[in-house]
């Protein structure tokens, strides 16, 4: 059986939309599937790599690599999206390409970044971990770390940094899929909202879905002990 909830929820474009949340009900009247997984049920994607989930994550990453920061022209906010999802008339799509990106580092002025921009994250304004010396952030946003400390400045002069961020990574469903969404939408969908991250590639949704002990390598499920737990 399915339990359907419908509600008006604030979405990425800053408007309220009617959203459906469909929950598979437990036939025996008990915990939901997500709760059972958290309690240690035999759920194979938590025990070993699942090809379907792996392909989903790779596809999400490929899309994210090509994303940019969509900044609303009315200063209502910004969100990480694909160019096609960013209004050409109502917003500005901040995406580095060709010669428009910043240099990789202040010591290497010739090599420009082509991957980015990212809403609320920039190697030029992140103090921790700083992009410098032997630890320059790669020219691939899907390999960027979470910035834990921003430079102390109210304004940077960068469109993608001085905007109000409207969406962050949200882990939805037992498949461990990730979407950049508003907190409101994420909570309605019973997802896990990552306040600390800016990109889906910075979070490991399956690790969150599975719960229990974190994977040794966040990308490799290793909860073999589930075989004995259930």
């Amino acid at each position: 059986a399915q339990h359907v909830t419908t509600q008006l929820v604030l979405r990425n474009k800053g408007v309220y939309e009617s959203v459906k949340y469909i929950q598979q009900e437990n036939f025996w009247i008990g915990p939901s599937s997500i709760d059972l997984i958290h309690l240690g049920a035999k759920f194979s994607p938590c025990i070993r790599k699942d090809q379907q989930i792996e392909q989903l994550v790779l596809r999400e990453r490929d899309l994210e690599r090509d994303s940019g920061c969509c900044v609303q022209n009315d200063h209502s906010g910004c969100i990480q999206t694909q160019r096609k999802d960013c209004s050409e008339t109502l917003a500005t799509f901040v995406k580095w390409q060709d010669d428009t990106g910043p240099p990789m580092d202040k010591s290497d002025l010739g090599q420009k970044r082509t991957s980015g921009a990212v809403c609320h994250q920039d190697p030029r304004t992140c103090e921790e971990p700083a992009s410098s010396g032997a630890h320059i952030w790669p020219d691939d946003i899907t390999k960027w770390p979470i910035c834990t400390e921003q430079a102390k400045s109210n304004r940077t002069g960068f469109l993608h940094m001085d905007c109000q961020i409207k969406g962050r990574p949200c882990c939805i469903s037992t498949k461990g899929s990730c979407e950049i969404t508003t907190r409101e939408y994420c909570e309605f969908m019973h997802g896990y909202f990552h306040e600390e991250a800016t990109l889906c590639s910075q979070v490991h949704c399956l690790d969150k879905v599975c719960g229990l002990l974190p994977f040794l390598n966040p990308e490799v499920p290793d909860q073999f002990y589930r075989l004995w737990l259930s």
Epitope: D99, T100, G101, P102, P103, K106, S107, L109, G110, K112, R124, T125, E127, A130, S132, A151, K152, S153, R155, T156, G157, F158
Partner: antibody
Framework: QVTLKESGPGILQPSQTLSLTCSFS??????????VGWIRQPSGKGLEWLAH???????YYNSALKSRLTISKATSKNQAFLKIANVDTADTATYYC???????????????WGTGTTVTVSS | QVVLTQSPALMSASPGEKVTMTCSAG?????MYWYQQKPGSSPRVLIY???NLASGVPARFTGSGSGTSYSLTISRMEAEDAASYYC?????????FGAGTKLELK
């Protein structure tokens, strides 16, 4: 308000070492992304970049003068320094220090300049 | 090093006249910076990243260009615009400035 002020010896003789100080306020060289640069301008001529120093103590020099230049900073005193060894009459110029910022810029730029200090090298 | 050649070296314009000066780079650069220096004063930044107006700079100043060819335009000359103008690149070390364009009031 950001201000910078250069100070130097005014006059010195060839082969001596020129020591310049840039005292600034309104920003700190311990702040991420900040830098201070030195630029000179012989009377009636154009601008020449000499060197700059970053918040993380990285230093960059004009290769044509590198062997004679030393840039340093005293973060707690809000000061930056430039030494030019073995000066010659060709080093006679107005010396400016300037704050480096990347506000809104893909690169960096000299966004606030000091008033300059005139240095004459003469025997 | 990237050599920047400014032209003309000297020019004069009447109030209200449109003024355009150019900066040619010896090799391709990503963007250009423009500084204004009035007699007896230190330089101040006018334009950063080729076309962005620095804080407090009047909207009559515009910058444009790409690759090896850049320009600074004053839509309507005013008496206070009489000054020397320098272009500068931050594309590679050593950082270089152009020799300047001196703009006089006619």
């Amino acid at each position: 308000q950001v201000t910078l002020k250069e100070s130097g010896p005014g006059i010195l003789q060839p082969s001596q070492t020129l020591s310049l100080t840039c005292s600034f306020s309104g920003f700190s060289l311990s702040t991420f992304g900040m830098g201070v640069g030195w630029i000179r301008q012989p009377s009636g001529k154009g601008l020449e970049w000499l060197a700059h120093i970053w918040w993380d103590d990285e230093k960059y020099y004009n290769s044509a003068l590198k062997s004679r230049l030393t840039i340093s900073k005293a973060t707690s005193k809000n000061q930056a320094f430039l030494k030019i060894a073995n000066v010659d009459t060709a080093d006679t110029a107005t010396y400016y220090c300037a704050r480096i910022s990347n506000y809104g810029s893909n690169y960096w730029y000299f966004n606030v300049w000091g008033t300059g200090t005139t240095v004459t090298v003469s025997s | 090093q990237v050599v920047l050649t400014q032209s003309p070296a000297l020019m004069s314009a009447s109030p209200g006249e449109k003024v355009t000066m150019t900066c040619s780079a010896g090799s391709s650069v990503s963007c250009m910076y423009w500084y204004q220096q009035k007699p007896g004063s230190s330089p101040r930044v006018l334009i950063y990243d080729t076309s962005n107006l620095a804080s407090g700079v009047p909207a009559r100043f515009t910058g444009s260009g790409s690759g090896t060819s850049y320009s600074l335009t004053i839509s309507r000359m005013e008496a206070e615009d009489a000054a020397s103008y320098y272009c500068q690149q931050w594309n590679s070390y050593p950082l270089t400035f152009g020799a300047g364009t001196k703009l006089e009031l006619k």
